[in-house]
Amino acid sequence: SGTTNTVAAYNLTWKSTNFKTILEWEPKPVNQVYTVQISTKSGDWKSKCFYTTDTECDLTDEIVKDVKQTYLARVFSYPAGNVESTGSAGEPLYENSPEFTPYLETNLGQPTIQSFEQVGTKVNVTVEDERTLVRRNNTFLSLRDVFGKDLIYTLYYWKSSSSGKKTAKTNTNEFLIDVDKGENYCFSVQAVIPSRTVNRKSTDSPVECMGQEKGEFREI
């Protein structure tokens, strides 16, 4: 379907990290504007970003209502200054996005090591439980609240004096690892959802090393 002098949007792409979700598309508009609609499989479409000249639309507020649903967005093109105009089929020109299931597809944001504490030859490493924009009972949920045991963290750790890495895994946000007494260690963590087929892993967190301010050390 089409409207004279308008170009259909193309390259509709979901950009989503920790459920913050933006739909992007092309082209930059010339004498046209866009409106976005989003729907679950019910086909009850909700309009967002009305008559915009942007080529992105923040759909976070819609997808966080149920992150396990599958969503589709469509971008309508209208002639600038004549948004009532429709195509020969009685509808404005539109293009569909790919399907998007936030729970299965949102990228896992880069995690942060919140703290580490050494007690003798044990070190407890804690990963920050990042807040998402998903709400329950008017409270923002953390990544762990949303994913539960589907989310694990992998810890990479190594002696500051060597390059050989060891790994540990946890389905909480804490690790308890054995270390050699008197050695300084460096740590990096990665969020992983093993059950996923796409976007399974986050990027690695910034490296934190013992002897720097994040840690607490108690020799026993």
């Epitope: 379907s1 089409g2 259909a8 193309y10 729907s39 679950t40 499989k41 019910s42 086909g43 009850d44 479409w45 649903q69 589709l72 195509g87 020969s88 089929a89 009685g90 509808e91 539109y94 293009e95 569909n96 790919p98 399907e99």
Partner: antibody, heavy 118, light 108 residues
Amino acid sequence: EVQLLESGGGLVQPGGSLRLSCAASGFTFSSYGMSWVRQAPGKGLEWVSVISGSGGTTYYADSVKGRFTISRDNSKNTLYLQMNSLRAEDTAVYYCAKAPWTYYFDYWGQGTLVTVSS
Amino acid sequence: EIVLTQSPGTLSLSPGERATLSCRASQSVGSSSLAWYQQKPGQAPRLLIYGASSRATGIPDRFSGSGSGTDFTLTISRLEPEDFAVYYCQQYGSSPRTFGQGTKVEIK
């Protein structure tokens, strides 16, 4: 397992009315668009109407607009098609279909035959 | 409304051969607003492909869809005995939704 079971078909005279029903099970009914598609004997498929999950949006083929009304009762997991002012050319097998986004039809019932004849 | 024209009307092939079915729209239906269905005698249609190229649940990978805009293709890489049937394309780029007239794939 998704199941769609149509009923209400039969023989009706031109100008008469008929109400088709489609009982759905095996999925969350209110979460999906639903549609009616028909097929005249020996002919191809013809889309008739579609309704969104909430019932708030409906579309019709030009050939039935003003005569047919699609509706749904989400509490009963049932889809309906009220057919008025029936014509001989409405004779067909009527299929109920699950319609994600009101776009395409991923599960179909086995159909119910509507015959309009004097 | 958008008119879909399928070709050929009938395709006579042997099991094991490749089948290529065409669906052409009278105007653009967008890059991906097309579905393909299979129907056997006395049965309801079955969804094969949606979004022009995405296989529906449980559909064997010998079925593939391609195309965009006005020209779409359904390919069956190696015909199995159970694939002989009528195939319909359907667009959802605008309302009313419309079907092609069908292509019959018959045993040669």
